[in-house]
């Protein structure tokens, strides 16, 4: 869907100069943003988002891909998002991450902090079209989760599904499959607690078409499991080897968007853990 | 830039088959449904179905449900539209077309079913 | 199936004056999502139809802002607000609400 150009994160082909290439990218409705909490607004008729089918994804296998831009895993369109205005299914859902002995890795932050790495699971608008790609050029065509990731004690089973595999897509184009297992549990706990805002792929061609849920609480990794996926994948099909790391991209401005959350904040500050 | 080009004028005898074919380029093939529509002479436009491009599975509307078939060839960015057992009231033009919105069109391809 | 319903001919217009053409739908086109599923196509002579309008108002890419097009669930107005000789040809609603997906018989565009 980028229409086959090429893009990095840095260097002569990277964030930018995305816009020289893929103009929208240079729009004013981009993505990620940095969430101010005492700036959002509250919206009592936000509700807790209910994802259909996350914990009995099928019996196939999932299709596991290094793009050279991240891991991304496909998603049978049995998965699907109930609280949203439309019907959203489940395509794919894909990682962010910084590299070894650096803060940051997320794309969203939270009153200006960043987490190790975050993921994305991505819908699209079934009412209206037929694949993801129609859907990713209109607006609010595709809805995104975005789960911001932190360092724990223990090692979370659910992302250990999706990081126990990552060996066998070491280098761009490798594909493998991985046994069905519960999404659900990638998942924060308490899905009531989210900011809505409408905003961009992170990624060429940065269409404008996204409908945001970004979790307040987050998810959980182990520091073992945050490193193999900062040191397992390659960006680059053979040698010379590139690590693929940092495939995050900066903050983009608000401009006049509003962010909505569906709770009220106890206070201004970022908590984390479960109440 | 996307582009879809279709096949040449075709000029067949009732009861013999026609594959048209659609090539796609400037774009993945498998990341966007391909609906094909007819047109017969000095008339307006009819849908008759979709094929779902990255698993193959075709959808007809009623009146090209039997004769006509959706198929692809999608290391080479091809989709078919094949019609069996033709009869004269299949003469048209015949357009492929991406997604649901039909963004882009194929230039079409004429069938003429003649004795 | 869901019938669209179309004039055959528009009324005559002038070249720089504006033009409406109508079309009606035998059931709502309004999802319980919000959006209606009515798109027009032009098809100038000889050639390929061309995306005009998707979702009843919203403009398809490279089209000029000279078209808009707005309406009911089932009845609608495409609007043409300064023809140019361009513009000839005749266009089509269709909706895309339930399959089969279905197109209006078409309105040929007059030029006076």
């Known amino acids: 869907a980028d229409g086959g150009q090429h893009w990095t994160y840095e260097g002569p082909h990277g964030q930018d100069h995305w816009p020289a290439s893929y103009p929208e990218c240079g729009n004013n409705a981009q993505s990620p943003i940095d969430i101010q909490t005492d700036s959002v607004t509250f919206d009592p008729d936000l509700p807790a988002l209910q994802p259909h089918g996350y914990d009995q994804p099928g019996t196939e296998p999932l299709d596991l891909h290094n793009n050279g831009h991240t891991v991304q895993l496909s998603l049978p369109s049995t998965l699907y998002l109930g609280g949203l205005p439309r019907k959203y299914v489940a395509a794919q859902l894909h990682l962010h991450w910084g590299q070894k002995g650096s803060p940051g890795g997320s794309e969203h932050q939270i009153n200006s902090e960043a987490t190790f790495a975050e993921l994305h699971i991505v819908h699209y608008d079934s009412d209206s079209y037929d694949s993801l790609s129609e859907a990713a050029e209109r607006p609010q065509g595709l809805a995104v989760l975005g789960i911001l990731i932190e360092v724990g004690e223990t090692k979370n089973i659910a992302y250990e599904h999706i990081l126990s595999h990552l060996h066998e897509v070491r280098h761009k184009d490798q594909k493998t499959s991985v046994p069905p297992f519960n999404l659900r549990e990638l998942l924060p706990k308490q899905l009531g607690q989210y900011f809505r805002y409408n905003g961009s792929l992170t990624t060429p061609p940065c269409y404008q078409s996204v409908l945001w849920t970004v979790f307040y609480r987050r998810s959980q990794i182990s520091m073992e499991q945050l490193e193999k996926l900062q040191g397992t994948l390659f960006s680059t099909e053979e040698e010379p080897s590139k690590l693929l790391v940092q495939n995050y991209r900066a903050l983009q401005p608000l401009n006049q968007r509003m962010v909505f959350a569906s709770f009220i904040q106890a206070g201004s500050s970022y908590t984390t853990g479960e109440m | 830039q996307v582009k879809l080009e279709q096949s040449g004028p075709e000029l067949k005898k009732p009861g013999e088959t026609v594959k048209i074919s659609c090539k796609a380029s400037?774009?993945?093939?498998?990341?966007?449904?391909m609906h094909w529509v007819k047109q017969a002479p000095g008339k307006g436009l009819k849908w008759m179905g979709w094929?779902?491009?990255?698993?193959?599975?075709?959808t007809y509307a009623d009146d090209f449900k039997g004769r006509f078939a959706f198929s692809l060839e999608t290391s080479a960015s091809i989709a078919y539209l094949q019609i069996n057992n033709l009869k004269n009231e299949d003469t048209a033009t015949y357009f492929c077309?991406?997604?649901?919105?039909?963004?882009?069109w194929g230039q079409g391809t004429t069938l003429t079913v003649s004795s | 199936d869901i019938v669209m319903t179309q004039s055959t001919f528009s009324n005559p217009v002038t070249l720089g004056t504006s033009a409406s053409i109508s079309c009606r739908s035998s059931?709502?086109?309004?999802?319980?999502?919000?959006?209606?599923?009515l798109y027009w196509y032009l098809q100038k002579p000889g050639q390929s139809p061309q995306l005009l309008i998707y979702?009843?108002?919203n403009l398809a890419s490279g089209v000029p802002d000279r078209f808009s097009s707005s309406g009911s669930g089932t009845d609608f107005t495409l609007r043409i607000s300064r023809v140019e000789a361009e513009d000839v040809g005749v266009y089509y609603c269709?909706?895309?609400?339930?399959?089969?997906?279905?197109f209006g018989g078409g309105t040929k565009l007059e030029i006076k």
């Open positions: 269709a909706q895309n609400l339930e399959l089969p997906y279905t």
């Open positions: 094929i779902n491009t990255e698993t193959g599975e075709p």
């Open positions: 059931k709502s086109l309004l999802h319980s999502n919000g959006i209606t599923y």
């Open positions: 979702q009843m108002s």
């Open positions: 400037g774009y993945t093939l498998t990341d966007y449904s």
């Open positions: 077309t991406r997604g649901r919105e039909r963004g882009f």
